[in-house]
Interface confidence: low
């Protein structure tokens, strides 16, 4: 996460509903209002949904959205007949825009789309489309649900009555009725070609406030194939100001979307603001928690025969639910031990929680770098065999990374285990969670949209052994926003090791003076729990409730023509001309705590995994670690700095070395293709030398790349 000090008063940010058309500009744009009347809000943390009511009183109303729709209690309404759609079958014009608003991805519709019927009071005009999604692997991301079942994505189309108002915004500001359709996207084994223009557009708005014209698409093709079965209820906007003015039409049947296409949603970035610190992070889990129905009645359409087909099958279908693709918590107790000078043994324990038993086998992936080449191998191990694997022919001049994934039925997989990094002939060991570059805006601060993390994500380092060392990356890689994907080994080697000044075949000692000794006091402490770094013999058993994952398939997301890379800019950014987006190095601030001298201290019990994460879940704070810190300006030239003992303790500079992108294209043909590692709890290294250093920052992040929380003490055993 990139943190920088905001040198000007914090701007308040408008609600998503505030997108409006600028009719005076030469180009029609989607704008986010920054008027003082529109308070800042977020999907988690201090400005999260439970706090919306403080600045938007309607958010505490009795007729709020979204809701869970219980089919058995929905009454058939004879007035809810076929929808009349007008213009939906036409191709969109080339003036249709998509924008990353920071809270959603919105499409401003520039053509005339009208809907009537379904009990709507008039003929309504479509204004915009918005999307809500989860965090990874088809996890629950929809706002509405049916019989408790949520979907990976919910698309919402908003309408207003043009006979009554000259604009959508006027209708909202005057608290008058608007219409909204909710469409669920369901995981399919096949790409949905109708979504191609949308998916392509998403790649052009990866960064906050980016906008792009969309290729022509047919709006009808984004709706369910059958429109006859829908629910109707009266509710609200699902974002502040939560006005209770929305006539909701929730379609029963979903629209297919493949995992490959879903990755485009998971690759979107946003910026979050906590006090005067802004952070760039993935935009994920952008759904409001569900609201009580209270005295409302949910109706269902009376279109003949529309409810007959496959109702039971549909209700029983587990695809798209929270733990649908992730079949278990990660394999735990990852260890790598040298058997001799040329062989290693990787061992692990079975996941603590199995959502969809049984585990059939395990996939062991390891990648390495040699002579600047990256290679990766994957093999499987039956679950009824010993949970260990031997890697022979280990080269002392190569960097190895290992990770394990449990494989369940129907190609369902667990999250990845910790990634263990191995390199021979290394004697100095340390652990931490952030590889850091601090920054402060100049007179003209860089746009937050230009400061997104690289695909490597945050890293947790643990290691042990002489002459061998091991490093675990607790969080691994998220999707590459540039459309290319670097291998684990390349990112760790080129970005992290080079950036920290490691040279040759070993990791040099790392002075504690390089790291700032304090962290910013951020309101985000309520967003995620800080966990202590534990220098013990095994990994934490499972992630806490806010644990998250961001796997992507290797090579996924690369489109034809997207591989051209410009030369590095000063920030080490790679610029991709086709999509006009930048994929800059992840720059993060970190604090340091020294290892305690005591041995054999009692370990706290691991936090149990929670398969049903919600936007509200797991928000806890650990008192007693509050520290104030302000970022300090640093040299931004990007030149190499070998940190030495004489360095100012409040300054950190790391060389920005971009990861080498692989040339693989996503083929979609190999279901066994390994995915990038997920975010996992911090490891506990096997053993640490006396001068080990611990850099502790909470790795559990709501949106996979959240604000830094308060530090917790490191321990040695």
């Amino acid at each position: 996460v990139l943190h920088y000090v905001v040198c000007f008063p914090a701007l308040t940010e408008g609600y998503v509903g505030a997108l409006h058309e600028n009719r005076h500009g030469s180009a029609v744009q989607i704008r986010r209002r920054k008027a003082s009347g529109d308070p800042y809000w977020a999907y988690s943390g201090a400005y999260g949904p439970e706090h919306w009511v403080t600045s938007s009183v309607s958010c505490g109303g009795r007729h709020q959205s979204p809701i869970d729709i219980l089919d058995q209690y929905a009454r058939v309404g004879e007035e809810y007949q076929e929808l009349q759609l007008d213009g939906f079958d036409n191709e969109s014009s080339n003036k249709t825009w998509m924008k990353n608003t920071g809270k959603t991805v919105a499409i401003l519709l520039k053509d005339d789309y009208f809907v009537s019927g379904a009990g709507l009071p008039g003929r309504f005009k479509a204004e915009k489309v918005e999307f809500h999604w989860g965090h990874s692997n088809g996890s629950a991301g929809s706002e509405h649900s049916i019989n408790g079942r949520r979907f990976p994505v919910e698309m919402q189309i908003f309408f207003y009555n043009p006979d009554d108002f000259d604009s959508f915004q006027t209708a909202i500001s005057e608290n008058r009725i608007i219409g909204a359709m909710a469409i669920f996207f369901q995981v399919s084994p096949r790409d949905n070609s109708a979504l191609d223009p949308i998916i392509h557009g998403l790649k052009g708005v990866v960064h906050h406030e980016k906008e792009t014209f969309l290729d022509p698409f047919v709006l009808r093709d984004l709706l369910p194939a059958s429109l006859g079965s829908y629910y109707r209820y009266t509710g609200s906007l699902t974002t502040p100001p939560c006005s209770e003015i929305v006539e909701w039409i929730v379609f029963r049947r979903p629209v297919p979307i493949s995992y490959h296409q879903l990755e485009a949603f998971y690759s979107i970035f946003t910026t979050e603001q906590q006090d005067h610190v802004k952070s760039v992070e993935y935009l994920r889990n952008n759904f409001r928690p569900q609201q009580r129905l209270h005295d409302r009645v949910v109706s269902k359409s009376a279109v003949r025969d529309s409810w007959n087909h496959d109702m039971t099958d549909f209700l029983e279908n587990p695809l798209g639910t929270e733990a649908s693709k992730v079949c278990s918590s990660p394999p735990i107790h990852m260890k790598v031990q040298p058997l001799n000078q040329t062989a290693l043994q990787v061992s692990w324990s079975q996941p603590e929680t199995i959502y969809h038993p049984p585990i059939m086998n395990y996939m062991i992936s390891y990648s390495w770098t040699k002579n600047e080449d990256e290679k990766e191998k994957t093999f499987t191990k039956d679950s009824d065999k010993d949970l260990k694997a031997t890697i022979s022919h280990v080269s002392p001049d190569s960097l190895y990374l290992f990770r394990v994934q449990a494989v369940c039925r129907n190609d369902m997989r667990s999250d990845f285990s910790q990634t263990m990094l191995f390199q021979a002939n290394t004697t100095r060991i340390f652990q931490g969670t952030r590889i850091v570059k601090t920054g402060v805006p100049t007179a003209s601060p860089a746009s937050s949209a230009d400061m997104a993390p690289i695909s490597s994500g945050s890293s947790t380092w643990t290691s042990s052994g002489i002459p061998f060392s091991f490093v675990s990356m607790a969080t691994g890689m998220g999707p590459s926003s540039s459309g290319s994907q670097a291998t684990v080994a390349s990112v760790v080697t080129s970005t992290l090791l080079a950036g920290l000044g490691f040279g040759g075949g070993g990791i040099s000692s790392f002075p504690s003076t390089v790291w700032p000794t304090r962290l910013p006091t951020a309101a985000s402490a309520s967003k995620q729990a800080a966990r202590p770094v534990l220098a013990t013999t095994e990994a934490l058993a499972s992630p806490g409730p806010d644990g998250d994952s961001s796997p992507t398939k290797d090579g996924e997301g690369t489109e034809e023509g997207e591989k051209d890379e410009k030369s590095e800019s000063e920030d080490g950014e790679r610029e991709h001309e086709e999509d006009g987006e930048k994929d800059s190095e992840k720059k993060e601030k970190s604090g340091v705590t020294h290892a305690a001298e005591e041995r054999n201290q009692t370990e706290p019990s691991p936090t149990p995994s929670s398969p049903n994460r919600t936007a509200e879940g797991g928000h806890q704070t650990i008192p007693g670690h509050e520290q104030d810190h302000t970022a300090v300006p640093t040299d931004q030239t990007g030149g190499r700095r070998d940190a030495g003992p004489g360095l100012d303790p409040d300054m950190v500079t790391s060389t920005q070395v971009p990861p080498t992108a692989t040339e693989e294209q996503y083929a979609g043909s190999d279901p066994k293709r390994p995915e990038m590692p997920s975010k996992k709890p911090m490891s506990r290294g096997d053993r640490f030398s006396e001068d080990s250093r611990f850099i502790t920052v909470n790795p559990a992040e709501k949106n996979t790349s959240g604000m830094i929380s308060r530090p917790a003490p490191g321990r040695m055993e």
């Epitope: 369901q186 399919s188 084994p189 096949r190 790409d191 949905n192 070609s193 109708a194 093709d221 194939a225 059958s226 049947r253 297919p256 493949s258 995992y259 490959h260 087909h309 496959d310 099958d313 549909f314 279908n317 059939m360 086998n361 494989v407 369940c408 039925r409 129907n410 190609d411 369902m412 996503y666 083929a667 979609g668 043909s669 190999d670 279901p671 066994k672």
Partner: antibody
Amino acid sequence: QSLEESGGRLVTPGTPLTLTCTVSGFSLSSYAMGWVRQAPGKGLEWIGIIDSRGSTYYATWAKGRFTISKTSTTVDLKITSPTTEDTATYFCAREDSYYYDSFNLWGPGTLVTVSS
Amino acid sequence: SFVLTQPASVQVNLGQTVSLTCTADTLSRRYASWYQQKPGQAPVLLIYRDTSRPSGVPDRFSGSSSGNTATLTISGAQAGDEADYYCATSDGSGSSYQCVFGGGTQLTVT
């Protein structure tokens, strides 16, 4: 709800042939439709499907040899250049709308004989 | 390419229970469907997603899956159950999606 194949006949090798599946009782905009064939005395062999949006997917061996298309009420299978190995009964089938890989409605089939 | 293996033929006594198997290297990660085909007729879907039974299919037919083997079990076999039985699953995803049928098992009821 029913399916009926037509167009099966005796053709000489290399002569393109189009089979048609006519649907009734449901809309092709809501379902994927597949073609499966069965050579005499042999097992079922999946050729390909066309989904509700018109995207087509083919078996590896069938790519280039077959083309699937559709209108509002029919699904066509074109055998671009038949060989004697293409002699079989051709079935069209409707794919379950929520569960892929399963066909819950089948036509009776139409026989294609390729012989010189 | 992905191959589903079924025994060519299986015999069962009237009223007895019989299990038909379908195996593949990575079937543990996929759902299997089962079809019944009687001579001169089109196939009929019996089981989908390993264990689910469409309406109208007698509950004598059940599906299960363990490891790399999917199993169709017919309890209380009847003369009318004599037919060919095919398993099927999908291979690949996204644009490379395809469906695969097993070679079929001829069930004889004696």
